[in-house]
Amino acid sequence: IWELKKDVYVVELDWYPDAPGEMVVLTCDTPEEDGITWTLDQSSEVLGSGKTLTIQVKEFGDAGQYTCHKGGEVLSHSLLLLHKKEDGIWSTDILKDQKEPKNKTFLRCEAKNYSGRFTCWWLTTISTDLTFSVKSSRGSSDPQGVTCGAATLSAERVRGDNKEYEYSVECQEDSACPAAEESLPIEVMVDAVHKLKYENYTSSFFIRDIIKPDPPKNLQLKPLKNSRQVEVSWEYPDTWSTPHSYFSLTFCVQVQGKSKREKKDRVFTDKTSATVICRKNASISVRAQDRYYSSSWSEWASVPCS
Amino acid sequence: RNLPVATPDPGMFPCLHHSQNLLRAVSNMLQKARQTLEFYPCTSEEIDHEDITKDKTSTVEACLPLELTKNESCLNSRETSFITNGSCLASRKTSFMMALCLSSIYEDLKMYQVEFKTMNAKLLMDPKRQIFLDQNMLAVIDELMQALNFNSETVPQKSSLEEPDFYKTKIKLCILLHAFRIRAVTIDRVMSYLNAS
């Protein structure tokens, strides 16, 4: 058993048939010695009396908020949560496996630049009685500070018969140098509590590997005289690291017809303009990627040819 | 350790070109190592990230763009020198700060060159003949060093009397390639920045 936060304790349980469970001794936080009674989860039914209460925790129903009272007055609370281990593996029932970029990916993170700011998100089908708490650091043995906000519900989607909820959190490394060469990864730890179930999820990454620039901005077309060609121009996204001559981007320009089956013409360039042939009803899209470290491409920025 | 002596710079373009070739070569070599050594811990997640130039050179700090010198987090680790912009580049004269930056890059390349050559000598003794260093990568390191045009004491290649542990050598190769790729990215960024200044 260990303390998650004040008055909240996690009981780690090996889950198998006939498992003996964990014996937990709860002590009432009071100088009082006599006339103490114990109840569980808002029920008035008395479970026991005395300054301590010993319980055998075997399953979820044995957890909950244990309260000690004296003469109708509440003295203290202890909330017990369960962390379930089956076949040596901690349960991952609360979050959905996103399977990208590999199986058992519960947390996904992205950064728009090298400032040390990043966003992580996760998915669940659970809609109620759910809380998350996020901690992060650079390295684990001698951790350096990363500050994370509160996790918030950022999207809801319908997937077949199920509703899926996306939560996200923003974190910022306390003292980040955009030009630094990372040798210790960022660690992100998410504590998830659903009813009386506790689970924890972790992700470890270098900012350089989770970079995904915003799409190029101010995408414009300039027709060239007496030609089907157009000059496409764009700018670096505002969120990208500066100076741009140091944090350079490379771009992919694509001409796509109305039909998805039509052949796509693609041009790669380090410049912020390109000359392409604009077909009728086609659209021109541009996306960006770090020029020197091949992490993710940005989403496309698009304009119609007409 | 003697600091390399700066000689007049013949323009940044050749360095930019060579640094791009370097990044391409080390990325290809790393990809090859990851494929060939698929049953060894050779991915970014599996290896320890070591920097053989740590405490010997200060490339990131010495080559910090002027715009980032206002960022205290970029300055906190040591007395930082940084690239200054000004007429020095236009007149093709290397400023003192830039000389420190480029000499630091040169020293990096020299250290990695020695390590890679020593390692290659060991890998050539491996009866499995599983992986060798790409000669193109070694050549590109050499070309960039020549383009930087520093005169520096040559470092003798390390020789080892004991029987090489090929498993450890291959893991060390992965560690070295990952670190060198990260440094090659920094070098490319620096050359791009200098080229634009």
Epitope: S43, K58, Q65, K195 | -
Partner: nanobody, 124 residues
Framework: EVQLVESGGGLVQPGGSLRLSCAAS????????MGWFRQAPGKEREFVAV????????YYPDSVKGRFTISKDSSKNTVYLQMNSLRAEDTAVYYC?????????????????WGQGTQVTVSS
Amino acid sequence: EVQLVESGGGLVQPGGSLRLSCAASGRTFETIAMGWFRQAPGKEREFVAVIRGSGVATYYPDSVKGRFTISKDSSKNTVYLQMNSLRAEDTAVYYCAATTNRFKNTDYTTYDYWGQGTQVTVSS
């Protein structure tokens, strides 16, 4: 999902005893409490006995206290209701139920899973 199957109901004389069993299957580890509820014709469903978890707490209404005992064999995923000193007013369909809710474990409206019910008739 949790599936519940009751057994053990039947006809018994006043003062007699019966033991009901409820076998649970499926995601039983998600349940917080299991209980027995009964419903006589034309009456609302009422709570008879509830066991919390592996037995940290048991709840009974005054009408059955001292006569009925709820117990659980976690290894068999089975909950039992031992009914002694049965009376005519105990006649009803007895339902086994399971809840994933922490609170109001004696309120049948908070229960997620139900068995099909077993008839208990107390009559001479």
